[in-house]
């Protein structure tokens, strides 16, 4: 089970209208450049077999991957939203740095790995798709971690 006190974000992180709006605008803009509507990254397959109490840890993994492998490499695109949203998400990642789970997390890593593999397989269009799903990432973090 998670060390739940560390797998928590204050709800105030998700109640800032400006940065919430910028996050959703970034997702919307990227989704207009995403032509692959058949593939979904954040959805029931990601959460399958993961208990509610483990989902913040799961979303921490997805957030870190998205920052390191998607947003940082694409940081020159989708301005001005990107330059505001990336630091916001990086702060959330930092606040979740002590979120761990005790025991076996293989089922979680398996689900996250499938997401990573999908993004990598699609190449740049996978990265665009991940940016286009930042609204879902935001909502998933909020639902799982507050």
């Amino acid at each position: 089970a998670p060390i739940s006190s560390h797998c928590r974000l204050d709800k105030s992180n998700f109640q800032q209208p400006y940065i919430t709006n910028r996050t959703f605008m970034l997702a919307k803009e990227a989704s207009l450049a995403d032509n692959n509507t058949d593939v979904r990254l954040i959805g029931e397959k990601l959460f399958h077999g993961v208990s509610m109490s483990e989902r913040c840890y799961l979303m921490k993994q997805v957030l870190n991957f998205t920052l390191e492998e998607v947003l940082f490499p694409q940081s020159d695109r989708f301005q001005p939203y990107m330059q505001e949203v990336v630091p916001f998400l990086a702060r959330l990642s930092n606040r979740l740095s002590t979120c761990h789970i005790e025991g076996d997390d293989l089922h979680i890593q398996r689900n996250v790995q499938k997401l990573k593999d999908t993004v990598k397989k699609l190449g740049e269009s996978g990265e665009i798709k991940a940016i286009g799903e930042l609204d879902l990432l935001f909502m998933s973090l909020r639902n799982a971690c507050i």
Epitope: R40, G43, M52, M139, N143
Partner: antibody
Framework: EVQLVQSGAEVKKPGASVKVSCQAS????????IHWVRQTPGQGFEWMGW????????RYAQKFQGWVTMTRDMSNTTAYMELPRLRDDDTAVYYC????????????WGQGTLVTVSS | QSVLTQPPSVSVAPGKTATITCGGN??????VHWYQQRPGQAPVLVIY???DRPSGIPERFSGSRSGNTATLTISRVEAGDEADFYC???????????FGGGTKLTVL
């Protein structure tokens, strides 16, 4: 079999309150959000909010914020929706439904509870 | 504010194919779900994520999407398919699900 079973029909006077229950079975109750959605002939479907059975956390539609209360009892795997200060236009069929992520399709619905508000 | 538009009614002869559309402004990156509601009953999920079918739903039910229009297709229509059909998306900007107004399918 996965199912959500709701309490029976209610007739209430304006100004009264109603509490509808939704008992879950056949799956791990804590792993799915329970949403409440009402349906009226004029307005169609109207989402009211959800409760996270694992934490008791809630998220309400703006219209129902400060009005509706959604709770759950883990011991009997039941979610509740309480609506005080009923008005005539709250007459509707109230459904509970589950979803996995908080923003996914409602894959299982309760059978519905008709709440009639009439003086 | 995103609004989902469905035709109020669709009529089809048994054995033929029924198509029900759902139009929405800017749901390019939204996932569209479809529910069937028979008279006096609760809705049943028949298609999710645009085109996926839950277990137990006949293969005759399929979904697709092109641009801002999603389509539910029911092939080899049977009398028992007569019901109201609703499309739904989760609107992240208002953080709530939006439902179409419903389409009444009549089997002639």
């Amino acid at each position: 079999e996965v199912q959500l079973v709701q309490s029976g029909a209610e007739v209430k006077k304006p100004g009264a309150s109603v509490k509808v229950s939704c008992q879950a079975s056949g799956y791990t109750f804590s792993d799915y959000y329970i949403h409440w959605v009402r349906q009226t002939p004029g307005q169609g479907f109207e989402w009211m909010g959800w409760v996270n059975p694992d934490t008791g956390g809630t998220r309400y539609a703006q219209k129902f914020q400060g009005w509706v209360t959604m709770t759950r009892d883990m011991s009997n795997t039941t979610a509740y929706m309480e609506l005080p200060r009923l008005r005539d236009d709250d007459t509707a069929v109230y459904y509970c439904a589950r979803d996995l992520t908080g923003f996914d399709p409602f894959d299982i619905w309760g059978q519905g509870t008709l709440v009639t508000v009439s003086s | 504010q995103s609004v989902l538009t469905q035709p109020p009614s669709v009529s089809v002869a048994p054995g033929k194919t029924a198509t029900i559309t759902c139009g929405g402004n800017n749901f390019r990156n939204k996932r569209v779900h479809w529910y069937q509601q028979r008279p006096g009953q609760a809705p049943v999920l028949v298609i999710y994520y645009d085109s996926d079918r839950p277990s137990g739903i006949p293969e005759r039910f399929s979904g697709s999407r092109s641009g801002n229009t999603a389509t539910l297709t029911i092939s080899r229509v049977e009398a028992g398919d007569e019901a109201d059909f609703y499309c739904q998306v989760w609107d992240s900007s208002t953080d709530r699900p939006l439902f179409g107004g419903g389409t009444k399918l009549t089997v002639l």
